[in-house]
């Protein structure tokens, strides 16, 4: 498994701030778990990155994911006056150069390297909820949502609006 | 342009029940969570809880959550706040206000509703 | 339950002072701090998000600052329409809380 440092997380904030042209709102190292407290993990194997749901042994060290938070219009702005429709985004970056991508022929989550401007596949809309837990919506592709599937992560369709606490795709998210 | 408008004051007596109506305009009424707040004479701002008008989910501040039912009638686009045994100590101007971002809190209260006084008095 | 606890509750100032209004929140809340202006018999406005991010159509004489535990909102010159009272607001999480306001009176 691998993570940011902490001093890592100030050059790695200059760093980020161009990717797409515009600063990120705020940057926060945390690592990312499940609703039942399983830890999202990333490990180097045949030279890409897997992701893995897991359960930590006592005293492992949780991996760091840095989130950094965009603004952005709203698609569905009725107003169309720029004051209304704002929705909050993040790019999910576990090491320099890798973010997690939406790949939505395949229902999965990969990490890829990337080169700047981030694409659209690597920006997810944040919902928070009242359990205080957090979903991450595709931009590419609304009402799908990063989930947790058979001890991965996957892309995961929220047909219904009842869905939308479901437990499969909500996740911590802890500075510890 | 967004607005939300809310009922007209109400005087209720002791263990009486009240039901304050906000009706949204302007936006997509299921896009944003729609927070309750109240402010007694003179006092700050409390909220009440929230609801997500796209499934219904509900969250209630510790302070009201055996009084309070948080309700939405999409097809009319209105959210409703019932509070129930009132006492004195409720009255106080009922507000309703909608989140700034799509889908989370983050960003606070971007549009309010004008306020709904509610006297408890016997 | 994260508490808010704003300083000073009140203050006196002039047409065209500075003033500064301090903000500070019991648990780390990253940037999700807003700030809203509210005046006798009127609903609170909006004026900064995010800790430092101007609402549409605030004026500029409004800045916000900070972030973790620690906030400022500042008023560079005072005008006669800013006399009002303040409020912070979090949210990073559930229960939303208030600051407990602080009135901004003229001296």
């Known amino acids: 498994a691998f993570g940011i440092s902490g001093v890592q997380k100030y050059t790695r904030a200059l760093h980020d701030s161009s990717i797409t042209g515009i600063s990120p709102i705020t940057e926060y190292l945390a690592s990312l778990s499940t609703y039942n407290d399983q830890s999202i993990t990333f490990a180097l194997e045949d030279e890409s990155y897997e992701i893995y749901v897991e359960d930590l042994k006592k005293d492992e060290k949780k991996d760091k994911v840095l989130l950094s938070y965009y603004e952005s219009q709203h698609p569905s702005n009725e107003s169309g006056d720029g004051v209304d429709g704002k929705m909050l985004m993040v790019t999910l970056s576990p090491t320099k150069d890798f973010w997690l991508h939406a790949n939505n022929k395949e229902h999965s989550v990969e990490l890829h390297k990337c080169e700047k401007p981030l694409p659209d596949q690597a920006f997810f809309v944040l919902h928070n909820m009242h359990s205080n837990c957090v979903s991450f919506e595709c931009k590419t592709d609304p009402g799908v949502f990063i989930g947790v599937k058979d001890n991965h992560l996957a892309l995961i369709k929220v047909d219904s609006s009842e869905n939308l606490c479901t437990e499969n795709i909500l996740f911590k998210l802890s500075e510890t | 342009e967004v607005q939300l408008v809310q009922s007209g004051a109400e005087v209720k007596k002791p263990g009486a029940s009240v039901k304050v109506s906000c009706k949204a305009s302007?936006?997509?009424?299921?896009?944003?969570?729609m927070n309750w707040v109240r402010q007694a004479p003179g006092q700050g701002l409390e909220s009440i809880g929230d609801?997500?008008?796209?499934?219904?989910?509900?969250f209630y501040n510790q302070n009201f959550k055996d009084r309070a039912t948080l309700t939405i009638d999409k097809s009319t686009s209105t959210a409703y706040l019932e509070l129930s045994s009132l006492r004195s100590e409720d009255t106080a101007v009922y507000y309703c206000?909608?989140?700034?971002?799509?889908?989370?809190?983050?960003?606070?209260?971007?549009?309010w509703g004008q306020g709904t006084l509610v006297t408890v008095s016997s | 339950d994260i508490q808010m606890t704003q300083s000073p509750s009140s203050l006196s100032a002039s047409v065209g002072d500075r003033v500064t209004i301090t903000c500070h929140a019991s648990q780390n809340i990253n940037v999700w701090l807003s700030w809203y202006q509210q005046k006798p018999g009127k609903n609170p406005k909006l004026l900064i998000y995010a800790a430092s991010k101007l609402h549409t159509g605030v004026p500029s004489r409004f800045s916000g600052s900070g972030s973790g535990t620690d906030f400022t909102l500042t008023i560079s010159s005072l005008q006669p329409e800013d006399f009002a009272t303040y409020y912070c607001q979090q949210g990073q999480s559930y229960p939303l809380t208030f600051g407990q306001g602080t009135k901004v009176e003229i001296k």
């Open positions: 302007g936006y997509t009424f299921s896009d944003y969570n």
């Open positions: 609801i997500n008008p796209k499934s219904g989910d509900t």
């Open positions: 206000a909608r989140h700034y971002y799509y889908g989370s809190s983050y960003g606070g209260f971007v549009y």
